[in-house]
């Protein structure tokens, strides 16, 4: 069965949008008007993972690109990257663990916890135009809360 997917954009709690910054990086910045067309559209796929009553496992691909957010160790630190995949094989229901995020909904906000590295979250900085990264703290300076906008 084809994996169930939806198209969406994400904005952090400060309303910063996510855009491409070079071929393999995302950054977060405030966009208005026509500039909103720059924001990346995600293909969010509902995949197998350690699902709970509070957490839904998803994979986050970039629409119409063979790129997926993935979590790997770099210099012994959990790191977020955009990874190129074979479009013939992805998305799939049984994604490798590094591609899987636990989507957590709290008070109408979403968090994306790495399945590979529990308690590490997709994060943005308070500052403008900084890379989207994997952060090991919530409720601190860095932003781990997002809202999702559906795209038809």
């Amino acid at each position: 069965a084809p994996v169930r997917s939806l198209h969406c954009t994400l904005r952090d709690a400060q309303l910063k949008s996510l855009v491409m910054s070079g071929p393999y990086e995302l950054k977060a910045l405030h966009l208005q008007g026509q500039d909103l067309e720059q924001q990346v559209v995600f293909s969010m796929s509902f995949v197998q993972g350690e699902e709970s009553n509070d957490k839904i496992p998803v994979a986050l691909g970039l629409k119409a690109k063979n790129l997926y957010l993935s979590c790997v160790l770099k210099d012994d630190k959990p790191t977020l990257q955009l990874e190129s995949v074979d479009p013939k094989n992805y998305p799939k229901k049984k994604m490798e663990k590094r591609f899987v995020f636990n989507k957590i909904e709290i008070n109408n906000k979403l968090e994306f916890e790495s399945a590979q590295f529990p308690n590490w979250y997709i994060s943005t900085s308070q500052a403008e135009s900084m890379p989207v990264f994997l952060g090991g703290t919530r409720g601190g300076q860095d932003i781990t809360d997002f809202t999702m906008q559906f795209v038809s």
Partner: antibody, heavy 122, light 107 residues
């Protein structure tokens, strides 16, 4: 060798809380999920819920409001608590290990305990 | 939740017979289907996972096939120790759900 063993009182009074323990050996509870399954006398199998290696839980809807699954990794024990029991909760209760093979076979249950019969009666 | 419809609910057969049990899922589950054997007073034992993968130590007379919504479990030549109840389980998504079971009895 992978083993799971259920234990707990065989008789529980209506409206009370059923408490069971699953003690495991041959694997670490931090690496594998454990499910609970029950089987009323002479009937089929019903999946109750599970606790993952990281401690997150998934409870099956019909029992969700009465169910608590927790664990103690250091003691290699998983516990099940089911509150406000009735005669309909009389069953053999099993714990079973999740295969936990990411991107291959995550949700199957490969090893089971021998089960323990719990009767709800006054 | 995914509903699993297993048939027949009971079956009488003789040693040496070929026996087939079917399981139908209410939605496409790819190959995420397991078959268990349960003997009276014992825990279920996993025989086949992923639709057709025989578990280590399980005799080759047991086999499974199918994908999507329709699955088949076959015992090619019944042995005395095979008389038991068999269950299918979908492991595609939570909550996990079982078929109603097939009781295999001696004719």
């Amino acid at each position: 060798e992978v083993q799971l063993q259920e234990s707990g009182p065989g008789l529980v009074k209506p409206s009370e809380t059923l408490s069971l323990t699953c003690t495991v050996s041959g694997f670490s509870l931090s690496d594998y999920g454990v499910s609970w399954i029950r089987q009323p006398p002479g009937k089929g199998l019903e999946w109750i819920g599970l606790i993952w290696g990281g401690g997150d839980t998934y409870y099956n809807s019909p029992l969700k409001s009465r169910l608590t699954i927790s664990k103690d990794n250091s003691k290699s024990q998983v516990s099940l608590k089911l509150s406000s029991v009735t005669a309909a909760d009389t069953a053999v209760y099993y714990c079973a290990r999740q295969t936990n093979l990411w991107a291959y076979d995550l949700y199957s249950m490969d090893y089971w305990g021998q089960g323990t019969l719990v009767t709800v009666s006054s | 939740d995914i509903q699993m419809t297993q048939s027949p609910s009971s079956l009488s057969a003789s040693v040496g017979d070929r026996v087939t049990i079917t399981c139908q899922a209410s939605t496409d589950i790819d190959d995420d289907l397991n078959w268990y054997q349960q003997k009276p007073g014992k825990a279920p034992k996993l025989l086949i996972s992923l639709g057709s993968t025989l578990r280590p130590g399980v005799p080759s007379r047991f086999s499974g096939s199918g994908s999507g919504t329709d699955f088949t479990f076959t015992i090619s030549s019944l042995q005395p120790e095979d008389f038991a109840t068999y269950y299918c389980l979908q492991s595609d998504r939570l909550p996990l759900t079982f078929g109603q079971g097939t009781k295999l009895e001696i004719k």
